[in-house]
Amino acid sequence: GSQHIRAEKAMVDGSWLDLAKRSKLEAQPFAHLTINATDIPSGSHKVSLSSWYHDRGWAKISNMTFSNGKLIVNQDGFYYLYANICFRHHETSGDLATEYLQLMVYVTKTSIKIPSSHTLMKGGSTKYWSGNSEFHFYSINVGGFFKLRSGEEISIEVSNPSLLDPDQDATYFGAFKVRDID
Amino acid sequence: GSQHIRAEKAMVDGSWLDLAKRSKLEAQPFAHLTINATDIPSGSHKVSLSSWYHDRGWAKISNMTFSNGKLIVNQDGFYYLYANICFRHHETSGDLATEYLQLMVYVTKTSIKIPSSHTLMKGGSTKYWSGNSEFHFYSINVGGFFKLRSGEEISIEVSNPSLLDPDQDATYFGAFKVRDID
Amino acid sequence: GSQHIRAEKAMVDGSWLDLAKRSKLEAQPFAHLTINATDIPSGSHKVSLSSWYHDRGWAKISNMTFSNGKLIVNQDGFYYLYANICFRHHETSGDLATEYLQLMVYVTKTSIKIPSSHTLMKGGSTKYWSGNSEFHFYSINVGGFFKLRSGEEISIEVSNPSLLDPDQDATYFGAFKVRDID
């Protein structure tokens, strides 16, 4: 009898362990990716940034995948996505080709199943970076809450990539799962 | 027999109560700190802001500590950190000594065990605030997802502190725990 | 005896199912509302934006209500609130009435019980949008962690609404519940 009760308890224990693990916060996917400045494209055109760190300094990833410059969702859910992009120029880097700049970021979602790319968030500013000043700086921050499905990919596009600030505290993006899909 | 079963059930109940409490959202640390303008330093140099409210208006804190101008982590975890910093100047507030300004924020983490300070996030802009305009305003927002250990401290550094907007809706920073460390 | 044990187990199972459901992430309220550009007010004055999508494109809502231009809280809790507001102007849209602009956003909370409205977050910038440039753009992002009670309403006010970017990736606001109130 006592043995049978223990078996029942183990069943209760076991089933609840699964449920508890699922409901616990430790399995929630996240990523914080920081710019890899060794491979920033040049030019002033809009480009997709493909080189990011995922495992050094502040960069980290769990239950998501980073591949081919894209952050891949492994687990359906609602995620908070964010990006911080810093642009800078010092006169010692040479003259700017133009003083009128569009400094922009686009956070895009690509679905493999239905090959398509959509912009989730954008931000930025037009700037007049005059030659009268020896140093210029500008940062953009965007963030929002989105439904993401397994296999979908998040990527970052910017204008004027050659002006990106390469510091890990300056140019980064990330995501963390907040909630399951009902 | 029935008594024994109840004892078993109580054991199950008890152990699960602990687990559930841990997995429930109500014990998650958070803080939202708003600027205390009675003690903003002057100057144009970069300074650490040490005066923040934690218990009035929108300001609040739970399972974290505010001490000596720093937000102290009491519980290991992954946290979303954010800061909103507003700068403003009206011509009645005094004449600007320069039109070329660097308006910046740095969110830093200090580890007591290994005495070191590192910038987690930065943002801002160089601005040209001409005397031709009677009012100037600029806001910075930064946010990101970071692993924080108990005892680590978060602080805010800004340039040009005398230009800070002292409103609680303007200049604030905060954190909330999203996830345990595996 | 075995039947009795199963009943005990069912009781344990049942009570824990409730607790687990409560502690699980799937019941957490959220909203991501995108601008409805068919009804943006004109002018340069500060206005409350009342037209938002809640069920098309990236817009979505769960366990919160959208009514009369306001996001209504249905469940007490601590929420992360955010807004991204983009302003833009192209010379083909006609000349600006003034080159000196205040481009601002205010995230406000209204309590019905005690009729009052308070600004939770603000952001923006004064801008000089010269006629020398054919296109101008500027984005604001704000975010913060706030205690919200059932029945309270969140709304968005902006200056210069006629300059708003009507894209769903540009102008939006949202909220998600992070934690219960103790």
Partner: antibody, heavy 122, light 108 residues
């Protein structure tokens, strides 16, 4: 050592004009805001005008707005005050003074030049 | 504009005595941004104190400043013969920058 040396003062009739100069040395002139402060005989001090380091922004006391113009030539390390439509009440010793450069807002005055006397009289 | 009123107009003291000079503002000075100057006859003013209480370079520690809001004080702990002069307060927390009318410290 920081030095400021004013010149250009003298006697002028009401409605007349005068241009004051202030030669600066001992510091990076273009990096500092500068001001003019005056002191009527036997009276207190009155701030007159200020200018940013780049010269891009200028500020004036209401009593001189529209009549006085502050300017600077950073290549010559010189500050100027062009005074037009002078009145008897503009009679004073005019000092040029350096902003400390430690704050983004123009603040105290340190150091001061020795001053130049402007007398407006018929 | 912020009006600064200094008192007394004249202070007659002997060397070695303590001098207390007052400066009252018509409204609170933002961030307590106040400075004090000393001016001797025929000379330009000299900065003594800035930021209410910070001594300028080369100023002896017998000069000290205090106060906040609308009421500020310059104290000379022990008057030396070279200290007798006119003293001005100046605020720079609001535009335009303004001065008090001065307090003359004379030898009794």
């Amino acid at each position: 050592e920081v030095q400021l040396l004013e010149s250009g003062g003298g006697l002028v009739q009401p409605g007349g004009s005068l241009r004051l100069s202030c030669a600066a040395s001992g510091f990076t002139f273009s990096s500092y805001a500068m001001s003019w402060v005056r002191q009527a005989p036997g009276k207190g001090l009155e701030w007159v005008s200020g200018i940013t380091g780049s010269g891009g922004s200028t500020y004036y006391a209401d009593s001189v707005k529209g009549r006085f113009t502050i300017s600077r030539d950073n290549s010559k390390n010189t500050l100027y005050l062009q005074m037009n439509s002078l009145r008897a009440e503009d009679t004073a010793v005019y000092y040029c003074a350096k902003d400390p450069g430690t704050t983004v807002i123009m603040s105290w005055f340190d150091p001061w030049g020795q001053g130049t006397l402007v007398t407006v009289s018929s | 504009e912020i009006v600064l009123t200094q008192s007394p107009g004249t202070l007659s003291l002997s060397p070695g005595e303590r001098a207390t000079l007052s400066c009252r503002a018509s409204q609170a000075i933002p961030y307590n941004q106040l400075a004090w100057y000393q001016q001797k006859p025929g000379q330009a003013p000299r900065l003594l104190i800035y930021g209410v209480s910070s001594r300028a370079t080369g100023i002896p520690d017998r000069f000290s400043g205090s106060g906040s809001g609308t009421d500020f004080t310059l104290t000379i702990s022990r008057l030396e013969p070279e200290d007798f002069a006119v003293f001005y307060c100046q605020q720079y927390g609001s535009s335009p920058r303004t001065f008090g009318q001065g307090t003359k410290v004379e030898i009794k």
